[in-house]
């Protein structure tokens, strides 16, 4: 079964950035991926980043930079300045879907004991959508 | 969740009509465009149509002059309207939510399919 592994980071040299890091482990080519912040893409979140692997990248504010690192995983970072500005306890959900076999969605957050610069391991934790 | 359900579609002979539509239900933010792909049987999907944040209309250059499609926001839903139908429109047809990515509309939602099938 396909999964989805969200990181979330703190950089320690700005402690107002985050760097949201997800990826997919599963054989499907992937269509699109979403990157949203305060729940699911479908489910209340604001979407803060859309990369498609061959027209591009979309981006909103807070979002400084999202690109594709491999084929199946991809990295946001967030720039921390006023009332857009991401807290430690924010939920960042990214969602991969392959049209039109399905899509596939796993949310993280900053871990409560983690040290600015020190990175989470990967936590899938899947929410599995059949659509 | 969004929810994306498709009707209308099913058999009919080649110059005929079939009205698809779909209901919406759900939102994901800052998506900015509606339409609908197809997949033929051993073919790569396509999109047929959509309807931009701006209202306006794009389709397919096989599908212009034949197809329409339209929107009702006060009932959350899509339709396409197809005529002069042929053997070459047989597929599922996809009703999706979407990003723009210049003149494409990139999936993020859709719904399971309806068939329709152009035949004799």
């Known amino acids: 079964t396909p999964e989805v592994w969200v990181q979330v980071r703190m950089e320690a040299t700005e402690l107002s950035s985050f760097t949201i890091r997800c990826g997919f482990l599963g054989s499907g080519s992937i269509s699109l991926v979403t990157v949203s912040w305060g729940g699911p893409n479908g489910a209340g979140g604001t979407t803060l980043a859309v990369l498609h692997p061959e027209r591009g990248i979309r981006q909103w504010a807070p979002a400084r930079q999202a690109r594709w690192e491999t084929q199946s995983s991809i990295s946001l970072i967030l720039e921390g300045s006023g009332a857009s500005s991401p807290c430690a306890n924010t939920t960042f959900c990214c969602k991969f879907a392959s049209f039109p076999e399905g899509s596939w969605e796993a949310c993280g957050s900053l871990p409560p004991s983690s040290d600015p610069g020190l990175s989470a391991p990967p936590t899938p934790a899947p929410i599995l959508r059949a659509d | 969740e969004v929810q994306l359900v498709e009707s209308g579609g099913g058999l009919v002979q080649p110059g005929g009509s079939l009205r698809l539509s779909c209901a919406a239900s759900?939102?994901?933010?800052?998506?900015?465009?509606m339409g609908w792909f197809r997949q033929a049987p051993g073919k790569e999907r396509e999109g047929v149509a959509h309807?931009?944040?701006?209202?306006?209309?794009r389709y397919v250059e096989s599908v212009k002059g034949r197809f329409t499609i339209s929107q009702d926001h006060a009932k959350n839903s899509l339709y396409l309207q197809m005529n002069s139908l042929r053997a070459e429109d047989t597929a599922v047809y996809y009703c999706?939510?979407?990003?723009?990515?210049?003149?494409?509309?990139?999936?993020?939602?859709w719904g399971q399919g309806t068939m329709v099938t152009v035949s004799s």
């Open positions: 309807i931009d944040s701006d209202g306006i209309p």
């Open positions: 759900g939102y994901t933010s800052r998506t900015d465009c």
């Open positions: 999706v939510v979407g990003f723009k990515f210049g003149d494409y509309c990139a999936p993020n939602d």
